[in-house]
């Protein structure tokens, strides 16, 4: 029933809608185009079950992981999928059901002592020591299958670019920080202000990709120097 759907205590959240440029107090300020959402997690009562959209494993239940439903499918369309049982193929720990972890591409049973050491190794590899409490709790005190992060996909919240997958950078998006695509040749880029300069940049673009730099477009003639278009160009 609708009541059971909408009044569940389990709170779920929606993958981020990606927004655009915004001003700062004094101009029209764009809000992050997210929406308040008290949703639900597990429901047995819905006839028309809809897969739950996600961007990170943490958004799924403890017996689910976040992935594209089709092999080699569109990375932008991800849903919560049922976790994989022992001896099933996996690519990361979160794919395996609680009590198991991913070793050599197969979900295997967690040996508590051996497993704890492996957790520490994985965290350090992925995020460095300063991220041991990335999601607000110590990732080393629980054996939840959700404690393993893959690199953030486009739209995932991040703290720094090393949290994001290859080809993405971590940049301001309205009032948050998300993984955004690194810019390609010819794409419009932003000459970031020096620290200490004023003005609230609510929407920021990524930096230019390897071998490219953000320069004034040669054929872009404008009277005002400050309003000239910058694009990613070969060195």
């Amino acid at each position: 029933t609708l009541n059971s759907v909408l009044n569940s205590n389990a709170i779920k959240n929606l993958p981020p809608p990606l927004g655009g440029a915004a001003g700062h107090p004094g101009s029209a300020v764009s809000a992050a185009p997210g929406i308040l959402y008290p949703g639900g997690n597990k429901y047995q009562t819905i006839d028309n079950y809809q897969p739950y959209p996600c961007a990170e494993d943490e958004e799924c239940g403890t017996d689910e992981y976040c992935a594209s439903p089709t092999r080699g499918g569109d990375a932008g369309v991800q849903i919560c999928l049922a976790c994989r049982k022992r001896r099933k193929r996996c690519m990361r720990h979160a794919m395996c059901c609680p009590g198991n972890y991913c070793k050599n591409g197969i979900c295997v049973s967690s040996d508590q002592n051996h497993f704890r050491g492996e957790i520490e190794e994985t965290i350090t590899e992925s995020f460095g020591n300063d991220h041991s409490t990335l999601d607000g709790y110590s990732r080393r005190t629980t054996l939840s299958s959700k404690m393993y992060h893959t690199k953030g996909q486009e739209g995932s919240v991040c703290l720094r670019s090393s949290d994001c997958a290859s080809g993405l950078c971590c940049d301001r998006h309205f009032w948050s920080k998300i993984c955004k695509p690194v810019l390609k040749e010819g794409q419009v880029c932003t000459k970031h202000r020096r620290k200490g300069s004023h003005g609230l940049e609510i929407f920021q673009r990524c930096y230019c990709g390897e071998g490219l730099s953000c320069r004034i477009q040669k054929d872009h003639h404008q009277a005002s120097n400050s309003s000239r278009l910058h694009t990613c160009q070969r060195h």
Epitope: I11, K12, N13, L14, P15, P16, P17, L18, G19, G20, A21, H24, A28, V29, S30, A31, A32, P33, G34, I35, L36, Y37, P38, G39, A55, E58, E59, L134, D135, G136, Y137, V157, C158, L159, R172, H173, F174, W175, S176, K177, I178, L200, I202
Partner: antibody, heavy 114, light 112 residues
Framework: QVQLVESGGGVVQPGRSLRLSCAAS????????MHWVRQAPGKGLEWVAV????????YYADSVKGRFTISRDNAKNTLYLQMNSLRAEDTAVYYC???????WGQGTLVTVSS | DIVMTQTPLSLSVTPGQPASISCKSG???????????LYWYLQKPGQPPQFLIY???NRFSRVPDRFSGSGSGTDFTLKISRVEAEDVGIYYC?????????FGQGTQVEIK
């Protein structure tokens, strides 16, 4: 579990102050912009304030500007709303809200009455 | 601020029959990222809002498919294909393309 839990509401006299807290858990709090939204009894929702992921940028609704202050402690995964010079019209349920993959708590009731 | 105007303000529907609510915004909610930031939610007495639709036409997970949203730019519609007793409450539209987030006045839906 991914959740937001508001606290600090109560009955207060006009002109007095109150500080609301919102404890976040289960997600990367320090990466998200956070909002406060309120709902007066029998009325619709009203957006109150927003703070950027790092706490450096803040923006307020005109109705609370100069009286309310939004802040956050990323080390404690907590969002705050300091409410000064409270008025009867500030009586509402206050919700803290996470933007982007948005979620919010159940709210905390603030009653301003003499 | 972007003004959101809903019609009708109240609606009495026979169970099993359809219902339709309109929402107009004072300016376009289409963003330059191609998304339109219009949402629908339902509120029942003493409860927090229950969000139904995001970005005009996308149902939040586990919302029954009798709820659908449509529209573009400044004109939007929420439809309930077959109203059920539990669908009663106040339905609101909301925009989040610009601060402050703003809301429609609400449409009270009741069962005949």
């Amino acid at each position: 579990q991914v959740q937001l839990v508001e606290s600090g509401g109560g009955v207060v006299q006009p002109g007095r102050s109150l500080r609301l807290s919102c404890a976040a858990s289960g997600f990367t709090f320090s990466g998200y912009g956070m909002h406060w939204v309120r709902q007066a009894p029998g009325k619709g929702l009203e957006w109150v304030a927003v703070i950027s992921y790092d706490g450096n940028d803040k923006y307020y609704a005109d109705s609370v500007k100069g009286r309310f202050t939004i802040s956050r402690d990323n080390a404690k995964n907590t969002l705050y709303l300091q409410m000064n010079s409270l008025r009867a019209e500030d009586t509402a349920v206050y919700y803290c809200a996470r933007e982007l993959r948005v979620l919010w708590g159940q709210g905390t009731l603030v009653t301003v009455s003499s | 601020d972007i003004v959101m105007t809903q019609t009708p303000l109240s609606l009495s529907v026979t169970p099993g029959q359809p219902a339709s609510i309109s929402c107009k915004s004072g300016q376009s909610l289409l963003h330059n990222d191609g998304k339109t930031y219009l949402y629908w939610y339902l509120q029942k007495p003493g409860q927090p809002p229950q969000f139904l639709i995001y970005e005009v036409s996308n149902r939040f997970s586990r919302v029954p498919d009798r709820f659908s949203g449509s529209g573009s730019g400044t004109d939007f519609t929420l439809k309930i294909s077959r109203v059920e007793a539990e669908d009663v409450g106040i339905y609101y539209c909301m925009q989040s393309i610009q601060l402050p987030w703003t809301f429609g006045q609400g449409t009270q839906v009741e069962i005949k």
